[in-house]
Structures are given as C-alpha cells and as structure tokens.
Interface confidence: low
Amino acid sequence: HAPEDPSDLLQHVKFQSSNFENILTWDSGPEGTPDTVYSIEYKTYGERDWVAKKGCQRITRKSCNLTVETGNLTELYYARVTAVSAGGRSATKMTDRFSSLQHTTLKPPDVTCISKVRSIQMIVHPTPTPIRAGDGHRLTLEDIFHDLFYHLELQVNRTYQMHLGGKQREYEFFGLTPDTEFLGTIMICVPTWAKESAPYMCRVKTLPDRTWT
C-alpha cells in the first residue's frame, strides 16, 4: 500500500502578505471534501515548538490571519496546515520560510487628487500597517521602509507624460490646459527591497478658466 500523498488533501500552503497583513492560505487537494477540516500552527524560525493558532483550529475555510503572530519585522516564521478528512485521513504541509519585510507586497497608495484651473495637486496619505511600535502606535510604510518614495505620472496625451517623485506627500503638476482631462498614476517605490506598489489611478479634469467669460 503506497503512502498517502499529502497533496491529495492539501495544496499550495503559503503566506499572502500585503502591507504587512499576513494571511495563510491553502487549497484542498483532489481528495479534499467540503467536510475536510484544517488546523493551523506557526512558529518562529529557530524555535522548536509549534504554536496552535486560536480561532484557526478545525476550520473549514481555507485561510487564516496570522498578522499578529508574525508581526515582528526582525523575525522569520513558518506556518503549517493539518487537514483531516471526514474519513479520518490527514495530511500536513508547511510554508516556506516567511519574512514579512521581504515578502509583503504593497497596495496602491491612498491619494487625493485635486483639480485646479492650470494644475493638478496630488496629496499622498500615509499608509498605516498592522505593525505596532513599542508604545502601541501603528507604524506607516514610511516608518518601516526608510528609502520609500513616491513616483507620480500624469498622462497629458498619448505621447507625453509628466513625472514627479520624492519622499514628500504633496505634489503639483503645473502648466496644464484648463478644462482638460488627465490620467494620474501614483506608485510607492522601495528600491532597497525591490518593491513597487500597484498604481493608484485618478482621472481628473482641470477646472475651466472663468477669467475670460
């Protein structure tokens, strides 16, 4: 009798991390059934013992939020899922080693685009994360990534774009034609960790020039 293949019950056990929200996800294998239950454990790299995650024991959903448990930026983590089918078969699969700093992806920034007659102003709002400092306050992406900067682009027409960038939060594209529509894209860049966020996009129209009416 050949040993059971864990992938029959359980596949693709991995962390999906975005802005330091760390979610463990997995898929059921071909032998998985709706009544298969899953139990989750995690541990810090270098530790011997696994810790059962409260709220993620004998669950039927295929995700578990481990943000709090994996919230130390200086540590590496593992998680594992044990699947148990109604028929009593079980399988356990472990994640690759997880570093939130290395593996988290960046969501688009939160931006306010403001139309003026001959300019468009863009204000980037700080991006909070679930990571907390020692005094309890939530850290922003800027607190964590020291070389983070913003890259802004304004599509003027099919062939011409204007670019701005920097660490500051307020930008303005000047010299624009009144009463004209423009497409703005804003991205977060972190060169040393080779990270780029998905772009925030705003379609804005400069105000009409009332001085001549």
Epitope: L73, S99, H146, K167
Partner: antibody, heavy 123, light 110 residues
Framework: QVQLVESGGGLVQPGDSLRLSCAAS????????MSWVRQAPGKGPEWVSG????????YYLDSVKGRFTISRDNAKNTLYLQMNNLKPEDTAVYYC????????????????WGKGTLVTVSS | NFMLTQPPSVSGTLGKTVTISCTGT?????????VSWYQQLPGLAPKLLIY???TRSSGTPDRFSGSKSGNTASLTISGLQSEDEADYYC??????????FGGGTHLTVL
C-alpha cells in the same frame, strides 16, 4: 537611559582590518535603525553606514563601499563595523549612533551617540 | 564625498541673534524636509539640536530654531549666551538614503 559603548579601535597599518563593536543598552535595540558616524581630527562628522532594524538592508558612504560591512546582532544588542583594506583617510573617531526613536531612519537626526573609539591608520 | 556648505565661522553679541546657513542642492536640502542641526563642544560627541528642519530635540532650548528656503537651511539662535560658543553642523538626507553633513561653523560669542 540609552547607553552606547564602542570598542575595537586602535592603531593599524594601511591595508589592515579592524572590527568595531557597539554594545547598546537602555532601549529596545531591535526596534532602532543604527548607524556609524566618524569624525576625523579637526574635521566635521561624516556618516559612514547604517543598518535597518532587520539587518537585511544596509547603507554605506560611497568611499567605504566594498571595504566596510555593517551588521547587528539583535539578540546580543550589539552593532558591528567590519573595516577591511583600511586607508589613512579612514583615521577618525568612530561613533555608534541612533535616531530619536524606534522605527526612525538615520536621516531623522542622530539623537544618541556613544563616546567613540579612535581608529588610526598609519604606516 | 559630498558635503553641505556652511560658513567656517560666525560671531554674535551676547543677548543678540545669529543665523548660520547651510547650502545644499535639490538632491538633498531642496527636495527633502530631513535637515538636522548639531552642536559640538570641544572633546564631546555632537548633540542633536533640531531635526526635520524645525523640530527641536528634547532638551533643546526654544532659543534655537530651524528653517529652510529652497536649497538652503538655516539655524537661528536668539538671546545668545556664552555657552552657545561651539561648532555647529547641519546634515540632510540625500537621495538613496545617504546622509550628508556640512563642513561646520564655529560660533564665537562676543
């Protein structure tokens, strides 16, 4: 209170190596970006190198890139600077420094300084 | 290695106001609000006075203030006291996480 104590300086010849250490206490070391700053006799300070809280990202002054390596051991609350192929122009007092608070980078200002350790490179 | 430009020396009269300038480029002072000022007394490590252009460090008297215009930052000391006689250094973030200091200014209190 915050204490930073540097050690490992001394007199060496050009081309030699030295390893500086900085023992930190009085604060949560693992939450602080750490830097080395040097000051040559009669000159102004010069930022040399910085290291992210994780130790995974390091920053260097152009003239020391490839020769100096900054590292940290958060379990031992210690910062290191490995200096290879030393040159006479590396002669300076080397300070271990931190920014004003946790999760702040070096460019937020250098609030806490050790007393420094003197490195002399001369033949 | 790049350095910000400061006057080598300035002097001021007891009780009066003095300003020390620090000139950089659009790649440092001009683009970023990460200018710091340090005071150094003989034989001691530098002491942080001002960071983020105009934020006073804990323990810095409110006689010290910082400002920035274009590529130039300034430290203003009002109500000069004899203990203010020292070397003053500016510093700024520079693109790609470098941090550059000025050459220093010696303040003499007359």
């Amino acid at each position: 209170q915050v204490q930073l104590v540097e050690s490992g300086g001394g007199l060496v010849q050009p081309g030699d190596s030295l390893r500086l250490s900085c023992a930190a206490s009085g604060f949560t070391f693992g939450s602080y970006f750490m830097s080395w700053v040097r000051q040559a006799p009669g000159k102004g300070p010069e930022w040399v190198s910085g290291i992210h809280i994780s130790g995974g990202i390091t920053y260097y002054l152009d003239s020391v890139k490839g020769r100096f390596t900054i590292s940290r051991d958060n379990a031992k609350n210690t910062l290191y600077l490995q200096m290879n192929n030393l040159k006479p122009e590396d002669t300076a007092v080397y300070y271990c420094v931190t920014p004003p608070g946790p999760f702040k980078a070096h460019y937020n200002g250098m609030k806490y300084w050790g007393k420094g350790t003197l490195v002399t490179v001369s033949s | 290695n790049f350095m910000l430009t400061q006057p080598p020396s300035v002097s001021g009269t007891l009780g009066k106001t003095v300003t020390i300038s620090c000139t950089g480029t659009s790649r440092d002072i001009g683009d970023y609000n990460y200018v710091s000022w340090y005071q150094q007394l003989p034989g001691l490590a530098p002491k942080l006075l001002i960071y983020k252009v105009n934020t006073r460090s804990s323990g810095t008297p409110d006689r010290f203030s910082g400002s920035k215009s274009g590529n130039t930052a300034s430290l203003t000391i009002s109500g000069l006291q004899s203990e203010d006689e020292a070397d003053y250094y500016c510093a700024s973030y520079r693109l790609y996480a470098d941090y550059v200091f000025g050459g220093g200014t010696h303040l003499t209190v007359l």
